[in-house]
């Protein structure tokens, strides 16, 4: 799969492949994988991809199921790249405070916060 | 500050304190703090709180600015708790796939994805 495929298209295709291969992926009934308790997904990317690794190691490869796992590894690569961009640019306190304000604002409106 | 204050109220109060103390917080003009380039904030919580630590170490403490940093440390505590919940529960492949589908669906609709 060329890495040039836009990430948004990659995600869409992966969702479709996930539905297609569901039966094969749940075949191992003894398998236990960590599942986050909350819906703040971005906080859990590490665990999600560890789970994908566990699933891949237990799934019979071949055909488009291989494409599914290849896609998922490209999505991981994209997310790792985004994580790198968290700390690459060192800016003044002024810009940091604007970003912090945005972060807290997003927490306030979009995060799923339990009381 | 009692930890019992709901996190949502804590975030609101912190936003207000941030505005109040802005001038004091930007006083050190030589300070450089990592600022993420993108808006996928949850991926960057580690760097954001490292930045807050840098800012705190360079800010003259006293009065309500102390309350600001106390609040921020409680928010960090909340997020750390959320991160712990990413891997505590081990479920069947079926549940994991439901969560993965939800994660990709959120990525598809809510994440800020550059082409």
């Amino acid at each position: 799969i060329p890495t040039e495929i836009p990430t948004s298209a990659l995600v869409k295709e992966t969702l479709a492949l996930l539905s297609t291969h569901r039966t094969l992926l749940i075949a191992n009934e003894t398998l236990r994988i960590p599942v986050p308790v909350h819906k703040n997904h971005q906080l859990c990317t590490e665990e999600i991809f560890q789970g994908i690794g566990t699933l891949e190691s237990q799934t019979v490869q071949g055909g488009t199921v291989e494409r599914l796992f290849k896609n998922l590894s490209l999505i991981k690569k994209y997310i790792d790249g985004q994580k790198k961009k968290c700390g690459e640019e060192r800016r003044r306190a002024n810009q940091f405070l604007d970003y912090l304000q945005e972060f807290l604002g997003v927490m306030n409106t979009e995060w799923i916060i339990e009381s | 500050i009692p930890t019992e204050i709901p996190t949502s109220a804590l975030v609101k109060e912190t936003l207000a304190l941030l505005s109040t103390h802005r001038t004091l917080l930007i006083a050190n003009e030589t300070l450089r703090i990592p600022v993420p380039v993108h808006k996928n904030h949850q991926l960057c919580t580690e760097e954001i709180f490292q930045g807050i630590g840098t800012l705190e170490s360079q800010t003259v403490q006293g009065g309500t600015v102390e309350r600001l940093f106390k609040n921020l440390s409680l928010i960090k505590k909340y997020i750390d708790g959320q991160k712990k919940k990413c891997g505590e529960e081990r479920r069947r492949a079926n549940q994991f796939l439901d969560y993965l589908q939800e994660f990709l669906g959120v990525m598809n609709t809510e994440w800020i994805i550059e082409s």
Epitope: R90, N94, D98, G105 | V37, H38, K39
Partner: antibody, heavy 119, light 107 residues
Amino acid sequence: QVQLVQSGAEVKKPGASVKVSCKASGYTFTNHHINWVRQAPGQGLEWIGYINPYNDYSRYNQKFKGRATLTVDKSTSTAYMELSSLRSEDTAVYYCARDYGNFWYFDVWGQGTLVTVSS
Amino acid sequence: DIQMTQSPSSLSASVGDRVTITCKASQDINSYLSWIQQKPGKAPKTLIHRADRLIDGVPSRFSGSGSGQDFTLTISSLQPEDFATYYCLQYDDFPYTFGQGTKVEIK
């Protein structure tokens, strides 16, 4: 493709206000800050401020604080710059420009809007 | 505010010449500087960001260098379409500030 299209030229009397629009297309509007820059005839460029469409937060050059107001309409992916108490020295071409990332370089510019202040 | 001093304010050059424009910041701006080209009656266009990173689609004859306070824009071999005014912009701190511009004219 990514585009910023600005409203047409305006002629205003001293003391009046002007509101310039900047319609974004080809990208997710809330992902990038919008900056406003002006250029008086034969002069250089001057930064007015920026607005973050993600949270409506704006920051101004002190020189324009109190006179310039930056707003956005997310439903139409449009940014606005309103300048009040106009004087003849506000005659300029006003540009909107998109930040590539947070507090980053301006990767896309609008075509400019000429505002003439004359009695 | 951070002052950006650009020099020269204008220069005359011929096609094929190597042209250098400098920009000096009144304080350390790290590498948060971009170079902008503007042709008469047109909107500005960013050529280089973060002091030395060429923007996609910009010809490789343009290059930038420097960090801290001193920065340079170089056009290795001037082309007819390069006759324009060039500005430096610091986006290190608010308010963002521009140099006063360098007009590159045909000799």
